[in-house]
């Protein structure tokens, strides 16, 4: 079962995601999707990071630790009840069938 | 207009080797996923292997993991499965599919045309 | 494995029908359910993904619904060229899988 994290609405939500770089600035992509984590990849892409930066985000969505040392945990601004459900956090660790994924469950009071 | 035209396919006894070529056409290859199904003569279809679109990434079926392996090379627009230890069970059709993923994943948008693989001694 | 069970494995219908057809998944797959239909001799074509998102340029009459466990496929009224096989698939969780397929045949 998914980790389960609150907050309030009007807040910001905190959906914490880590994983350790082989070396510093060594990243590898990172997915966020609204909905638990598929097959492969992301469903319903919120927020995207390459190799270098973060390349695709929605609004509200964004990085607030340091990425580049391999805090990948997502703030989600201003949240409303919509914004509960299940998030995926995929960390696509390269090599055959490498990836690390996350199910948290975000609860909006 | 979106093309995958698969090559490679034929009857290679049992033990034997094949390398299955998908040729892209018409969209960004290095934009998408790439994967590898097969169809049964019994009609069954099964995902056999996936590829990023860096090629980083790589997912196989269990039971070809250690014997097939899928690659791509971006620059030809060409996704590719190399089939050793080819065994009865993978007679089939196989079909290359693009796979949609950036702001949502979506297994096989298009499909190529199908090339057979015959293992028979 | 999660296994994907199509029912019925064949069905009779006719032109302007309403047809269902339904997957069942072994394991929890949220919406991660996709459909394709197959003509004799061609390449799955992809009709639905998120089990109810018709891809672009499928026709209004197929529909797809469902979450958890439980999915159908619905064409509301069957045109001629219709008649061909069906499966589903789920990409839930590794390996990806597909149903055993329905085909839809002529009464």
């Known amino acids: 079962s998914e980790v389960e994290y609150r907050a309030e609405v009007g807040q910001n939500a905190y959906l914490p995601c880590f994983y350790t770089p082989a070396a510093p600035g060594n990243l590898v992509p990172v997915c966020w999707g609204k909905g638990a984590c598929p097959v492969f990849e992301c469903g319903n892409v919120v927020l995207r990071t390459d190799e270098r930066d973060v390349n695709y985000w929605t609004s509200r969505y964004w990085l607030n630790g340091d990425f580049r040392k391999g805090d990948v945990s997502l703030t989600i601004e201003n949240v409303t009840l919509a914004d509960s459900g299940i998030y995926c956090c995929r960390i696509q660790i390269p090599g055959i069938m490498n990836d690390e994924k996350f199910n948290l469950k975000l609860v909006i009071k | 207009e979106v093309q995958l035209v698969e090559s490679g396919g034929g009857l290679v006894k049992p033990g034997g080797s094949l390398r299955l070529s998908c040729a892209a056409s018409?969209?960004?290859?290095?934009?998408?996923?790439m994967s590898w199904v097969r169809q049964t003569p019994e009609k069954r279809l099964e995902w056999v292997a996936t590829?990023?679109?860096?090629?980083?990434?790589?997912y196989y079926l269990d039971s070809v993991k250690d014997r097939f392996t899928i690659s791509r090379d971006n620059a030809k627009n060409s996704l590719y499965l190399q089939m050793n230890s080819l065994r009865a069970e993978d007679t089939a059709v196989y079909y290359c599919?693009?796979?949609?993923?950036?702001?949502?994943?979506?297994?096989?948008?298009?499909w190529g045309q199908g090339t057979t693989v015959t293992v028979s001694s | 494995d999660i296994v994907m069970t199509q029912t019925p494995s064949s069905l009779s219908a006719s032109v302007g029908d309403r047809v269902t057809i339904t997957c069942k998944a072994s394991?929890?797959?949220?919406?991660?359910v996709a459909w394709y239909q197959q003509k004799p001799g061609k390449a799955p074509k992809p009709l639905i993904y998120?089990?109810?998102t018709r891809h672009t340029g499928v026709p209004s009459r197929f529909s797809g619904s469902g979450s958890g466990t439980d999915f159908t496929l619905t064409i509301s009224s069957l045109q001629p060229e219709d008649f061909a096989t069906y499966f589903c698939?789920?990409?839930?969780?590794?390996?990806?899988?597909f149903g055993q397929g329905t085909k839809l045949e002529l009464k």
């Open positions: 599919a693009r796979d949609p993923y950036y702001s949502n994943y979506v297994p096989m948008d298009y």
């Open positions: 018409g969209f960004t290859f290095s934009s998408y996923y």
């Open positions: 590829i990023s679109n860096s090629g980083g990434s790589i």
């Open positions: 394991q929890y797959v949220d919406t991660y």
């Open positions: 998120s089990a109810s």
């Open positions: 698939a789920q990409y839930s969780s590794s390996p990806l899988t």
